[in-house]
């Protein structure tokens, strides 16, 4: 049987992103998200 191995050939980088809550609503403080592969997730 053939052996299959997942290897995308590139690394998926992640980065912490911080936003101000008042930019999207009336709350104060900071919202911290994570960008993985170009997509921001909670």
């Amino acid at each position: 049987d053939a052996e299959f191995r997942h290897d995308s050939g590139y690394e998926v980088h992640h980065q912490k992103l911080v936003f101000f809550a008042e930019d999207v609503g009336s709350n104060k403080g900071a919202i911290i998200g994570l960008m993985v592969g170009g997509v921001v997730i909670a």
């Epitope: 992103l17 911080v18 936003f19 101000f20 104060k28 900071a30």
Partner: nanobody
């Protein structure tokens, strides 16, 4: 866009304090979140602190939390960075920058306008 001019840098002993100012020209100052970044010799530019458009919200890099305070006066189109308990590793050129609302405040690419920088040297 806004034009930014920093001042207040200089030579200070370890444990000392400095207050940086950033004067902005333009009537749209309070449309921008404002941030401070720094760049040590031979290193990349790193985020230090940011303040929201209203001045109500702030955010700090872990390396300066509890020692630095960012604030703004929208009536004077000015943002400040009060730096206390300074350390030799705080030595850098400090840059003021402006970011549009809704962009990530802790990354360099969000900032559309930059000042020329002011040099802070912490040494005995």
């Amino acid at each position: 866009e806004v034009q930014l001019l920093e001042s207040g840098g200089g030579l200070v002993q370890p444990g000392g304090s400095l207050r940086l100012s950033c004067a902005a020209s333009g009537r749209t100052f309070n449309n921008y979140n404002m941030g401070w970044f720094r760049q040590a010799p031979g290193k990349g530019r790193e985020f230090v602190a940011a303040v929201s458009r209203s001045g109500v919200s702030t955010y700090y890099a872990d390396s300066v939390k509890g020692r630095f305070t960012i604030s703004r006066d929208n009536s004077k189109n000015t943002v400040y960075l009060q730096m206390n308990s300074l350390r030799p590793e705080d030595t850098a050129t400090y840059y003021c920058a402006a970011a549009y609302r809704g962009t990530a405040i802790n990354v360099r690419r969000s900032y559309s306008s930059w000042g020329q920088g002011t040099l802070v040297t912490v040494s005995s």
